[in-house]
């Protein structure tokens, strides 16, 4: 428990005086926070946080979902915590299967344990498949398993959290990793035709093709020196993962002389922007 010099506000004291506590499912959780300026207990786990204004936190019949961090806070904003594991052989993992990874960043597989004394806490591929050779991870029983530096190749990877319990391997529910690619180049844009010569009343239709690694690429048709929003129609294709194509078609059903000008197809992503133009000339 913390100790500070007299006169300074000190953090609350928690009983039992340990950083981690293991209780069996069905047993009682009883936590006492001692502080003259007690404000609240906060319980925090995967899904939510709960508060309790009583200085004694009592859960009569503990369940696996009572596993988590219990924090006592005083009026000075100082706090102290205890992590409670509710050991339930039938529910070794608490899971949130939403799993997104940004390319080149770390991502957390949220499968904290309810029993810290199991062994070999790790990730395994689904259906007995091995994980990619370059996949590195760091297990943390209280948070889950952190995948380091997510690669594009891990997209739609199926995996389980795994532990050994009494000599047997136990798997969590399935996680599917969805990787959001990092933009490492500007979009590729092209136009169906560089210039058009039309008679008044004829239809003007031009298509811009935008290619990028994800549908997050932004694109628009603009008329040079005009703020008017142009009406465009889209067709999209996913040619496999990270090979996205959008066709943005601009149509003027009955072109007029004053529609003449330069039209720009503009696309951008977080890396940068690209554009391509087409010229329309409408004659009487």
């Amino acid at each position: 428990q913390p100790s500070v010099s007299p006169g300074e506000p000190s953090p609350p004291s928690i009983h039992p005086g340990k950083s981690d506590l293991i209780v069996r499912v069905g047993d009682e959780i009883r936590l006492l926070c001692t502080d003259p300026g007690f404000v609240k207990w906060t319980f925090e786990i995967l899904d939510e946080t709960n508060e309790n204004k009583q200085n004694e936190w009592i859960t009569e019949k503990a369940e696996a979902t009572n596993t988590g961090k219990y924090t006592c806070t005083n009026k000075h904003g100082l706090s102290n915590s205890i992590y409670v594991f509710v050991r339930d052989p039938a529910k070794l993992f608490l899971v949130d299967r939403s799993l997104y990874g940004k390319e080149d960043n770390d991502t957390l597989v949220r499968c904290p344990l309810t029993d810290p004394e199991v062994t070999n806490y790790s990730l395994k591929g689904c259906q007995g498949k091995p994980l990619p050779k370059d996949l590195r991870f760091i297990p943390d029983p209280k948070a889950g398993i952190m995948i380091k530096s997510v690669k594009r190749a891990y997209h739609r990877l199926c995996l389980h959290c795994s532990v050994d319990q009494e000599g047997k391997s136990v798997l969590s529910e399935k996680f599917i990793l969805k990787v959001r690619p990092a933009f490492k180049a500007v979009p590729v844009v092209s136009v169906s035709k560089a210039s058009y010569l039309l008679r008044e009343g004829e239809e003007f239709t031009v298509t811009c093709t935008i290619k990028d690694v994800s549908s997050s690429v932004y694109s628009t048709w603009k008329r040079e020196n005009s703020q008017t929003k142009l009406q465009e129609k889209y067709n999209v294709w996913h040619h496999g993962d990270f090979n996205y194509e959008r066709q943005a078609t601009l149509t003027i059903s009955s072109a007029r002389v004053n529609d003449s000008g330069v039209f720009m197809c503009y696309a951008n992503n977080t890396f940068g922007s690209a554009n391509v133009t087409t010229t329309l000339e409408v004659v009487d």
């Epitope: 925090e44 995967l46 899904d47 939510e48 946080t49 709960n50 899971v95 949130d96 299967r97 939403s98 997104y100 940004k102 960043n105 689904c126 259906q127 739609r156 199926c158 399935k174 599917i176 959001r180 994800s214 549908s215 997050s216 996913h238």
Partner: antibody, heavy 117, light 111 residues
Framework: QVQLQQPGAELVKPGASVKMSCKAS????????MHWVKQTPGQGLEWIGV????????SYNQKFKGKATLTADKSSSTAYMQINSLTSEDSAVYYC??????????WGQGTLVTVSA | NIVLTQSPASLAVSLGLRATISCRAS??????????MHWYQQKPGQPPKLLIY???NLESGVPARFSGSGSRTDFTLTIDPVEADDAATYYC?????????FGGGTKLEIK
């Protein structure tokens, strides 16, 4: 318990912009993705986009790129959506929704945006 | 974009009988046996409420009268038996692929 609080209504003029809020409580705000959904009688429910937990990255439905901007303020556990260059087509109910264990488990009550001169 | 087509657009079912709503996706929403398809109920003036997630899992607190089934492109929401309180609009939603999409909705009326 988990709550997502949204203002009930916003009345805005055409051409203007509106920034609506979604204040989260009852969970660790930075651990969950927040999605935004538009509802109109004609178009039904449409996914606008998502702001990802932790790093504040966003992903948008192409239809709303350039129209909507998603942000978050971690200190106040509040997500925001700004819609610009408003027209009558933007009149709708806008919901924020927390993604939990692959699904939209919690929804705000919605903000009714009315675009009118 | 994955298009979700719900049918019927509306249906009227007598109290105590079974209601069945279908949702067809333009392409598969499955990965490794997980169907990223969910069902929501919405009543006027309220936000959608999650009923079924990952095609067949009942959300906590939702009555067991609601069930979901299906995989890949064809999914079904079943309410059996229907109660008066079930009058609402029901939506399917996929989050297998951006942009996430919703079905057009099915309005259930209780006779």
């Amino acid at each position: 318990q988990v709550q997502l609080q949204q203002p009930g209504a916003e009345l805005v003029k055409p051409g203007a912009s509106v920034k609506m809020s979604c204040k989260a409580s009852g969970y660790t705000f930075t651990s969950y993705n927040m999605h935004w959904v538009k509802q109109t009688p004609g178009q039904g429910l449409e996914w606008i986009g998502v702001i990802y937990s932790g790093n504040g990255d966003t992903s948008y439905n192409q239809k709303f790129k350039g129209k909507a901007t998603l942000t978050a303020d971690k200190s106040s556990s509040t997500a925001y959506m700004q819609i610009n260059s408003l027209t009558s087509e933007d009149s709708a109910v806008y919901y924020c929704a927390r993604e939990r264990d692959t699904r939209f488990g919690n929804w705000g009550q919605g903000t009714l945006v009315t675009v009118s001169a | 974009n994955i298009v979700l087509t719900q049918s019927p657009a509306s249906l009227a079912v007598s109290l105590g009988l079974r209601a069945t709503i279908s949702c067809r996706a333009s392409e598969s929403v499955d990965i490794y046996g997980n169907s990223f398809m969910h069902w929501y109920q919405q009543k006027p003036g309220q936000p959608p409420k999650l009923l079924i997630y990952l095609a067949s899992n009942l959300e906590s607190g939702v009555p067991a009268r609601f069930s979901g089934s299906g995989s890949r492109t064809d999914f079904t929401l079943t309410i059996d038996p229907v109660e008066a309180d079930d009058a609402a609009t029901y939506y399917c939603q996929q989050n297998n692929e951006d942009p996430y999409t919703f079905g057009g909705g099915t309005k259930l009326e209780i006779k």
